[in-house]
């Protein structure tokens, strides 16, 4: 036997070994070096376990392949230097291309899975956000229903309303006396007399339970019936559309009286203290406020995928009783405008276009503008800065009932100024309104300067939507306030009224509104420094009752597929205030303007059921002088939107609302008007006792955004 048994028969010629750092031959490409256990980096924070594992495996494989490729590169280098490789190294080198391909594939795979992982994360977040939105919307919808319910219950204290409901609009009774009594009893549960032995929140906790059970339609007994039965009764009232239409229970002043008391516009001009004109390019540093309004919408709008029942709680079609009848031109003759973007009726189109572009540059909003209106009613002059969305249908019937007292048109909605903003379903297109009045088109000359305005803070601003008080002397305005002294939504002549917003543009009177938003536009990010400083100037005191934003938000044409965009946009980032240019004007039109109730009159319900009419004098309706939310809708009640995407919650707003000391632009305080008949009134609901100015549901604080 050979003495060299230990030098055995190897398969390779020996030679000086390669540097000890190199790790010899790799025979099989599949033989991977032990992989380290690091999870893949760069993936979403919240990974599904499976995705983490996949990425971990890929990452491990990737590192093995990279290590292997590095080795192969080393082998090739050594080969190139003339160094001899052993069989394992040669085997490995022969698989160089395979390893390279595998490496590329693994990298691509890793990229794909990382992207997939991120998509999954986005989807998870979107889903969570959507669920949150749906929860919020459900809550808002519930709140809206509560408000509607509160409104109806409140109105049922009105003898005329009770009579109407018992007789029915077309002879078919809506409610029986027994049902009215049930509702009266329930009313006492949800709006109890203040029991000073109970803490307020305890007292309202009981009330809220009753309301909740009613909304749920529970079979539990209450007031000699069940919540379910009560809910059906209330739904019947809602579905009757009784409160959506005009009822001539008017007891205010009629046109002769009002006309007699109305000072001329010239007088008004003399009294006005217009703001000093600002260059419209300046940025207002004053805290801006975002107001939201999505009250008046068609049923189909903003529905999140599923069509709402039209008959649920309320019918969505808003019939604006005070149709935009021909505004008497004489009521507000053309007067010099302190802040006019368009100096005269029709300036050079190029100039106008340039101004629009300048304005848009400032606004930095993602809205698409068109030069002229889609609807050119009565050849009115058109503001160039018209926000474009889907054109409204001009063929809809423009006929609306004539006002009983046309002259009252200009002010009779005053007392209802705080009604609409209740909207839990209001379109939350946040509007930034600053006090600086630059480039506001028709600046009302009667607007008191901010310096002179004192807002009597009689009680905390606990309304659902801001109801800003006017000048103190205006606060006590009665229904006989002269038309010219009321906030005019538009002026005659060349001045162009601001557009009302949130109004159901399907209603005939609103067909002539030109400006609508393209709701598909993306929302500008909130972190832009301009966001809260935009000079969205509005007419300083146009009537709030229909508008919290100076532009009509056209939502009727929204398609279902657009909904996701809108919802995603508005809800997706609650920190993104949606800037809306505030000075788009609307040409004077005979059939256009903000609806006013045909006459001021008392809601015949009185201060509280069984209360004295006298006690209700200036309030006309629902709350005391503290300007709390209960005003409005004397002649009709525009139904609250019942869409599921009911508005985008106030949590969007990033700063506290502060209405101290000055009138917020574009908002009419909700003072109650009216003097006149006072007298005892029966208590059909057993609600005797002193007036209850806080007749409404528990109030909520409003938010203001800086």
């Amino acid at each position: 036997p050979s003495a060299t048994s230990h030098s055995g028969s190897g398969s390779k010629s020996s030679g000086p070994p390669p540097p000890s750092g190199s790790s010899g031959s790799e025979a099989a490409a599949g033989a991977a070096a032990p992989a380290s256990q690091h999870p893949a980096t760069g993936t979403g924070a919240v990974q599904t376990e499976a995705m983490k594992q996949i990425l971990g495996v890929i990452d491990k494989k990737l590192r093995n392949l990279e290590k292997k490729k590095g080795k192969l590169d080393d082998y090739q280098e050594r080969m190139n230097k003339g160094e001899r490789l052993n069989q394992d190294q040669l085997d490995a080198v022969s698989k160089y291309q395979e390893v390279t391909n595998n490496l590329e594939f693994a990298k691509e795979l890793q990229r794909s899975f990382m992207a997939l992982s991120q998509d999954i994360q986005k989807t998870i977040k979107k889903t969570a956000r959507r669920e949150q939105l749906m929860r919020e919307e459900a809550e808002q919808k519930r709140l809206k229903t509560v408000l509607e319910l509160q409104y109806v219950l409140d109105k049922l204290g009105d003898d005329d309303v009770r009579t109407d409901l018992k007789q029915g609009l077309s002879g078919v009774p809506i409610l029986s006396e027994e049902e009215l009594s049930l509702l009266d009893e329930f009313y006492k549960l949800v709006d109890p007399e203040r029991d000073m032995s109970l803490r307020l929140n305890e007292q309202y906790e009981h009330a809220s339970i009753h309301l909740w059970d009613l909304l749920e339609g529970k079979e539990k007994p209450v007031c000699g019936t069940t919540y379910k039965a009560l809910k059906e009764i209330v739904e019947r009232v809602f579905q009757s559309n009784y409160f959506d239409s005009t009822h001539n229970h008017q007891n205010g002043l009629c046109e002769e009286e009002e006309a007699a008391s109305a000072p001329t516009v010239e007088d008004q001009v003399a009294e006005a203290e217009p703001e000093p004109a600002e260059e419209y390019t300046e940025q207002s540093e004053v805290e801006s406020t975002e107001y939201v309004n999505r009250q008046f919408m068609a049923e189909t709008q903003f529905s999140s995928g599923e069509k709402e029942q039209v008959d649920e709680w309320t019918v969505e079609t808003v019939e604006v009783v005070n149709s935009l009848q021909q505004q008497p031109q004489a009521a507000s003759p053309s007067v010099p405008e302190p802040h006019s973007l368009t100096p005269v009726a029709q300036s050079d189109p190029l100039v106008r276009r340039q101004r629009v572009q300048d304005l848009m540059a400032q606004m930095q909003g993602p809205y698409n503008f068109i030069q002229d209106s889609m609807l050119d009613f009565e050849n009115q002059t058109l503001d160039p800065a018209i926000v474009s969305a889907q054109p409204m249908n001009p063929t809809q019937n423009m006929d609306m009932p004539q006002l009983v007292c046309p002259q009252v048109h200009s002010e009779s909605r005053l007392a209802q100024s705080n009604q609409v903003p209740v909207q839990p379903e209001a379109t939350q297109v946040p509007l930034v309104s600053s006090t600086s009045e630059g480039y506001t088109a028709s600046q009302p000359l009667y607007q008191p300067s901010h310096a002179t305005e004192q807002r009597p803070q009689k009680e905390p601003m606990d309304q659902i939507q801001a109801t800003i008080s006017l000048n103190t002397d205006q606060t006590t305005a009665s229904s006989s306030l002269p038309a010219a002294s009321q906030p005019q939504v538009f002026q005659a002549g060349t001045s162009k009224p601001l557009h009302s917003s949130g109004i159901n543009v399907n209603a005939a009177p609103f067909q002539s509104m030109q400006t609508v938003f393209n709701m598909n536009a993306p929302v500008p990010p909130a972190n832009e420094p301009e966001t809260l400083k935009q000079q969205s100037q509005y007419q300083a005191t146009y009537n709030q009752s229909f508008s919290s934003q100076p532009h009509q938000v056209e939502q009727t044409e929204l398609q279902q597929d657009q909904l996701q965009t809108v919802v995603g946009t508005y809800h997706g980032s609650q920190d993104q205030p949606h800037q809306v240019p505030g000075n788009h004007q609307q040409p004077p039109q005979q059939n256009t303007g903000f609806p006013r109730s045909s006459q001021p009159y008392y809601n015949s319900r009185g201060v509280s059921r069984g209360g004295s009419r006298g006690a209700r004098g200036l309030m006309n309706g629902y709350r005391g002088p503290a300007n709390g939310f209960r005003g409005g809708y004397d002649g009709y009640r525009p139904s609250f939107s019942n869409t599921p995407n009911s508005g985008y919650s106030q949590s969007q707003f990033t700063a506290p609302r502060d209405y101290s000391g000055y009138q917020r632009d574009g908002y009419q305080q909700n003072f109650k008007r009216g003097s006149g008949q006072s007298g005892p009134r029966g208590a059909p609901r057993g609600r005797g006792g002193p007036p209850r100015p806080n007749r409404g549901m528990p109030q909520m604080n409003t938010q203001q955004v800086n």
């Epitope: 030098s7 055995g8 190897g10 020996s14 030679g15 070994p17 390669p18 031959s25 040669l90």
Partner: antibody, heavy 112, light 112 residues
Framework: QSLEESGGDLVKPGASLTLTCTAS?????????MSWVRQAPGKGLEWIAY???????TAYANWAKGRFTISKASSTTVTLQMTSLTAADTATYFC??????WGPGTLVTVSS | DVVMTQTPASVEAAVGGTVTIKCQAS??????LAWYQQKPGQPPKRLIY???NLDSGVPSRFKGSGSGTDFTITISDLECADAATYYC??????????????FGGGTEVVVK
């Protein structure tokens, strides 16, 4: 892929013998080392020589130099020529591609 | 030529136990070392290459380590099938000096 050794026989001491390693399923190309290893009965493995097919370079164990010659006979065969055989050369002879693929071996017995 | 010394020549262990075999090179061979398992009547089967890399199909119970001159193979969780003779081999090649692909003397593993 497989290897098979052939040519093993019973020979007398001093005789010569040529063993052949035939590849199946592949052919010898530039990136293979072909080796011969032997194992005497009940003993350990003993490396004899290798040839690098790429450039024909060969290497031998010190004890095998001069008596053993490795060469590539064709694209699928490698041979080991043995001369001056002695009883100590009695063993099973394996051919291997690199050190991974081995043939079953062929027995060479040197006996008088 | 490099000389490979393998210890122990024989080792006995119970099923489920662990066996460690050492291999020492007479000079540094970096990590150019392979380990083989051979059962009677069969050609050797490579288990590990480059001192620590497991060949495909080889259970992870086999673990190789070491570099330079000292190398070990550890077989854990011994199974009956692991009963065999284990060899180490220098696999270094170089154009300059011939190291030779010498084998170690082998270690017989007996599983009880």
């Amino acid at each position: 892929q497989s290897l098979e050794e052939s040519g093993g026989d019973l020979v007398k001491p001093g005789a010569s013998l040529t063993l052949t390693c035939t590849a199946s399923g592949f052919s010898f190309s530039g990136s293979y080392y072909m080796s011969w290893v032997r194992q005497a009965p009940g003993k350990g493995l003993e490396w004899i020589a290798y040839i690098y097919i790429g450039d024909g370079v060969t290497a031998y164990a010190n004890w095998a130099k001069g008596r053993f010659t490795i060469s590539k006979a064709s694209s699928t065969t490698v041979t080991l020529q043995m001369t001056s055989l002695t009883a100590a050369d009695t063993a099973t002879y394996f051919c291997a591609r690199g050190n991974k693929l081995w043939g079953p071996g062929t027995l060479v017995t040197v006996s008088s | 030529d490099v000389v490979m010394t393998q210890t122990p020549a024989s080792v006995e262990a119970a099923v489920g136990g662990t066996v460690t075999i050492k291999c020492q090179a007479s000079q540094s061979i970096s990590s150019y070392l392979a380990w083989y398992q051979q059962k009677p009547g069969q050609p050797p089967k490579r288990l590990i290459y480059d001192a620590s890399n497991l060949d495909s199909g080889v259970p992870s119970r086999f673990k190789g380590s070491g570099s330079g001159t000292d190398f070990t193979i550890t077989i854990s969780d011994l199974e009956c099938a692991d009963a065999a003779t284990y060899y180490c081999q220098c696999t270094a090649v170089s154009s300059a000096t011939i190291y030779g692909n010498a084998f170690g003397g082998g270690t017989e593993v007996v599983v009880k």
